[in-house]
């Protein structure tokens, strides 16, 4: 058997670090057998069999000119093997960040903090951390580790499915190359990394007969689970065309009637979402949707379109609008967004 341990990486390649002494090992001989060493394609003897180094070639302070293929021969001139030297660096701890678009799953991505120049792979796992005793500040890794399954096709990402919202996790990402391994540990709480996807299906419609009103409606992001336990709250911004500043409101549900639009001008509207108890951060903004207030006449009745702002409008007084909806709006697929306060309270 070969006296040379096979480092992780392609066969026949041995590895070293620039500026350091490097030992190359002749793979096809018995340990200690004296061999001669040559650079591939060069007749000059690099190290003879009388060096006292047996089957090894020592390169002091290796640099890039030492990279390439080497040939070792036994005393009788037989080929002991060929070795390719590749220089690079041991791994540094990778940089890891984790994010969650819902309260049941999270993903972690990583990048090398330093390029090693060598074949590299990553090992990914996680543990659930549990509280020790009554003192909730004291935590220690307890259950696991479990593998964090990596995306196929070499994307630097792994996903933890079925995570517990109130638990803490310790993520382990280890960078491995032929010169060693280096581990980054990252403590993650779903509550702090939660960032929903932006709301979907944003529509902006005029309100017939009201030249300063626009009705915006949207839906939960498709990635948000259907269970009603964790709701989203929303932030809506709007501005007239060519106007640089956004106006911001926090609607109570999945629609909003803007009452201070500029008559005759198109308006851009966008919405963002966040966990209703302020876990994590606001989503990115949805793509903008556009709408222009109506210029038509006033209808005889007002549909119950939800909470109307009370900014003054140059419009006739009409019956008072529908009562405001509760601020903790359930998931639209489970309760219609016009259901009454009483019905909402049953599920709360």
């Amino acid at each position: 058997s070969s006296p040379c341990p096979q480092a992780w990486g392609p066969p026949g390649v041995q590895y070293g670090q620039p500026g350091r002494s490097v030992k190359l090992c002749c793979p096809g001989v018995t340990a200690g057998d004296p061999v001669s060493w040559f650079r591939d394609g060069e007749p000059k003897l690099l190290q003879g069999p009388d060096s006292g180094l047996g089957h090894e070639l020592v390169l002091a302070q290796a640099d890039s000119t030492d990279e390439g293929t080497y040939i070792c021969q036994t005393l009788d001139g037989a080929l002991g093997g060929t070795v390719t030297l590749q220089l690079g660096y041991p791994p540094a701890r990778p940089v890891v960040s984790c994010q969650a678009a819902d309260y049941e799953n999270f993903s972690c991505t990583w990048s090398p903090s330093q390029i090693s120049g060598l074949p590299t792979r990553y090992l990914t796992s996680y543990r659930k951390k549990t509280v020790l005793g009554a003192d909730s500040q004291r935590r220690s890794p307890s259950t696991g580790p479990w593998p964090c399954p990596q995306d196929p096709l070499g994307a630097a990402r792994c996903v933890v499915h079925g995570a517990e919202f109130w638990s803490q996790y310790r993520i382990n990402v280890t960078e491995v190359n032929p010169l060693g391994a280096s581990t980054r540990l990252l403590d993650v709480s779903l509550q702090s990394i939660l960032r929903p996807d932006p709301p979907q299906g944003l529509r902006v419609e005029s309100v017939p007969g009201y030249p300063r009103r626009l009705r915006a409606s949207w839906t939960y992001p498709a990635s948000w689970p259907c269970q009603p336990h964790f709701l989203l709250k929303f932030r809506l911004q709007y501005r007239p065309a060519q106007h640089p500043a956004w106006s911001t409101v926090e609607p109570a549900g999945l629609e909003e009637v803007i009452t201070d639009a500029v008559a005759g001008l198109p308006h851009a509207v966008r919405v963002s979402a966040r966990d209703f108890l302020d876990a994590g951060t606001w989503s990115t903004w949805s793509p903008e949707a556009w709408g222009t207030p109506s210029t038509g006449t006033i209808p005889k009745e007002i549909p119950a379109w939800g909470q109307l702002h009370t900014q003054p409008e140059v419009e006739p007084q009409v019956d008072s609008p529908a009562p405001p909806r509760p601020s903790l709006q359930p998931h639209p697929r489970l309760l219609d967004h016009r259901d009454s306060v009483e019905q909402v309270a049953v599920l709360a």
């Epitope: 540094a92 940089v95 890891v96 960040s97 991505t109 990048s111 090398p112 903090s113 330093q114 390029i115």
Partner: antibody, heavy 118, light 107 residues
């Protein structure tokens, strides 16, 4: 010679913007994470921001998050710091540094002074 | 963020004296701790990395020790050129933090 050279500092009004550059030479810039560290006059060192070799991960101190953007151009061996909405407390010497393993700063530039004042 | 404290904040010693500075982290940082020297008007210079490793080219009178939360930096025999401010710095996590510094001068 291995070195880092910062530029782009100067006097700017509160609310203004400035872009710092750091030119690297003497090492394989695209293999290393890079960092900005600052030092207010007469004060200690404060880490500002770091970026991985690919540019795919960035990290910011809470004090600058949302206002500063770190970036790099590996083809030009240059690191950048775009500073917006500047405040008086951003007044400092800004150093560019090359870390090993993200946070071990073994090479520093000479620094460039940013003064935010009206 | 991990907080770093240093003591003393300043000290005066005679040439040849042994000087010790301590650094404490608000949580366990393993051995991910570095020590820097900064002279007035100059950039910081790395002296010790990973708590106890001497950076190449740094005189052997500088040394460091410790792990976890408590660390020590020592100048075994203070020299006039060692007048500077010394900073500890952790890099256990992705947001490195520095200690407030210790100013060293000659009596």
């Amino acid at each position: 010679e291995v070195q880092l050279l910062e530029s782009g500092g100067g006097l700017v009004q509160p609310g203004g913007s400035l872009r710092l550059s750091c030119a690297a030479s003497g090492f394989t810039f695209s293999w290393y994470s890079m960092t900005w560290v600052r030092q207010a006059p007469g004060k200690g060192l404060e880490w500002v921001s770091s970026i991985v070799p690919s540019g795919g991960h960035t990290q910011y101190a809470d004090s600058v998050k949302g206002r500063f953007t770190i970036s790099r151009d590996n083809s030009k061996n240059t690191l950048y710091l775009q500073m917006n909405s500047l405040r008086a407390e951003d007044t400092a010497v800004y150093y560019c540094a090359k870390p090993e393993d993200w946070g071990l700063f073994d090479l520093w530039g000479r620094g460039t002074l940013v003064t935010v004042s009206s | 963020d991990i907080q770093m404290t240093q003591s003393p904040s300043s000290l005066s010693a005679s040439v040849g004296d042994r000087v010790t500075i301590t650094c404490q982290a608000s949580q366990d940082i393993n051995n991910y701790l570095n020590w820097y020297q900064q002279k007035p008007g100059k950039a910081p210079k790395l002296l010790i990395y990973d708590a106890s490793n001497l950076q190449t080219g740094v005189p052997s009178r500088f040394s460091g020790s410790g792990s976890g939360t408590d660390f020590t930096f020592t100048i075994s025999s203070l020299q006039p050129e060692d007048i500077a401010t010394y900073y500890c710095q952790q890099y256990d996590n992705l947001s490195p933090t520095f200690g407030p510094g210790t100013k060293v001068d000659i009596k």
